[in-house]
């Protein structure tokens, strides 16, 4: 009996430019003889329904149709037919199919590969055209993929134990597509500093599929206005 097992859940997520290994494990009732077996990897793009050969291995012959694609012959002996793709790009997302032939048997498995790019975030103060005691803070997130992103603003006052989400005076612009396929977006918070308590910490919070934990950029409102400062335990991305 010949079986192929891919990534559990049927989806693999990898960061842009990473050297990705797409998993494919072979289960066979006898020891594998790599000289008498074949492995072919196929790729089907997200945008058009056509399957393309990426890599093939037959006995003493192997060929990479995608530059740098490799299946390790040493790992293959122990049943690991995983495909390694260096420097993965956004357009290489899609369905990958691992086809294994141990004559006369054939088995295959498919996995969806998602390529993501993490946003970089920075905080800017824009005072141009603002009234007295009014400040506009801009949180720029750039270089992310896919397009879906969630940017919120929170404040943490001195007295209350938990942050408060700010919904008023927040404008998040449209996402802009970059030449490389990634996206940028800017969210603005308008503050009337005369109505806020000094010592209040404000955060731009960016949530994206590529991030395990949200990306946070902070500033603290001080008695002397307009001071962007790094606060305890914060990541500063300016």
């Amino acid at each position: 009996d010949l079986k192929v097992e891919m990534m559990a859940g049927g989806t693999q997520i990898t960061p842009l430019n990473d050297n990705v290994t797409i998993f494919c494990n072979i289960f066979y009732s006898q020891p594998l003889n790599i000289t008498s077996m074949g492995i072919t990897w196929f790729w089907k793009s997200l945008t058009f329904d056509k399957e393309v050969k990426v890599f093939e291995f037959f006995g003493d012959h192997q060929e990479a149709f995608r530059p740098g694609a490799i299946v390790s012959p040493w790992r293959l002996k122990s049943g690991d037919a995983s495909l390694r793709l260096p420097g993965i790009q956004l357009e290489e997302a899609g369905e990958y199919r691992c086809e294994v032939v141990v004559t006369p048997l054939k088995a295959q498995g498919t996995v969806q590969l998602e390529v993501v790019a993490s946003p970089a975030s920075r905080l800017l103060l824009d005072q141009v055209g603002m009234k007295e005691n009014e400040d506009k803070y801009m949180c720029e997130s750039s270089g992310f993929y896919p397009e879906a992103i969630n940017i919120t603003w929170e404040k943490q006052t001195q007295k209350f134990p938990h942050p408060i989400e700010i919904s008023e005076d927040v404008i998040t612009g449209p996402t802009i597509k970059n030449m490389d396929g990634t996206f940028n977006v800017t969210s603005c918070l308008k503050l009337n500093s005369s109505q806020e308590d000094p010592g209040t910490v404000y955060q731009c919070v960016v949530r994206h599929a590529s991030l395990h934990t949200p990306l946070r950029s902070n500033f603290t409102l001080t008695a002397a206005r307009h001071s962007l400062s790094e606060t305890e335990k914060t990541d500063n991305f300016s």
């Epitope: 001195q158 134990p161 938990h162 408060i164 606060t231 305890e232 335990k233």
Partner: antibody, heavy 117, light 107 residues
Framework: QVQLVQSGAEVKKPGASVKVSCKAS????????MNWMKQAPGQGLEWIGG????????DYNEKFKGKVTMTVDTSTSTVYMELSSLRSEDTAVYYC??????????WGQGTLVTVSS | DIQMTQSPSSLSASVGDRVTITCKAS??????VAWYQQKPGKAPKSLIY???NRYDGVPSRFSGSGSGTDFTLTISSLQPEDFATYFC?????????FGAGTKLEIK
């Protein structure tokens, strides 16, 4: 990292007073507000009151006014909560807590105060 | 003072179950609600703030929802370490007030 270390367990007789301490480290002490919570055995949580650590202001739950006094020693980064005229219903674990940022608020390990004759 | 009424007071469930705990405020508290988990002999640990935002490091199986007066904490698939007591808290105004707690036990 932020740490709130409270004083050890206390056993007091009814009518006595007790002073519980909470020593803070790992952050700029005076720029925060410290709350105190009470948790009686097997019960829920109650907010007792809070103190701004620069010592400027306190805010007590009406229920605890006259029972509790909060003070600060900025030189040692320590907050104190004194409970007076102790009764059996004051038997509880007392926690000092400080607002957090994005990992949640910080709590001391708790101090058990037992009032028993 | 704002009362926070939590239900149920206790709940038996099995690993893998989906569990929902509710909290009702006596007046509108907006989204100013936090949820805590407490294990015996330990200080409470905050899970959720602003009704639905998970603190960093809190597993995604924990989620909060609601606004105004009705709030819920949901654990999508119970893990052995989730058996504990859960409290809601309003922080729109002082005095801060808590629900009486929900003790989550193994069935």
């Amino acid at each position: 990292q932020v740490q709130l270390v409270q004083s050890g367990a206390e056993v007091k007789k009814p009518g006595a007073s007790v002073k519980v301490s909470c020593k803070a480290s790992g952050y700029t002490f005076t720029s925060y507000w410290m709350n105190w919570m009470k948790q009686a055995p097997g019960q829920g949580l109650e907010w007792i009151g809070g103190i701004y650590l620069s010592g400027e202001s306190t805010d007590y739950n009406e229920k605890f006014k006259g029972k509790v006094t909060m003070t600060v020693d900025t030189s040692t980064s320590t907050v104190y909560m004194e409970l007076s005229s102790l009764r059996s219903e004051d038997t509880a674990v007392y926690y000092c807590t400080r607002r957090g940022d994005y990992f949640g608020d910080f709590w001391g390990q708790g101090t058990l105060v037992t009032v028993s004759s | 003072d704002i009362q926070m009424t939590q239900s149920p007071s206790s709940l038996s469930a099995s690993v893998g179950d989906r569990v929902t705990i509710t909290c009702k405020a006596s007046q509108n508290v907006g989204k100013y609600v936090a949820w805590y988990q407490q294990k015996p002999g330990k200080a409470p640990k905050s899970l959720i703030y602003s009704a639905s935002n998970r603190y960093d490091g809190v597993p995604s199986r924990f989620s909060g929802s609601g606004s105004g007066t009705d709030f819920t904490l949901t654990i999508s698939s119970l893990q052995p370490e989730d058996f504990a007591t859960y409290f809601c808290q309003q922080y729109i105004s002082y005095p801060l007030t808590f629900g009486a707690g929900t003790k989550l036990e193994i069935k």
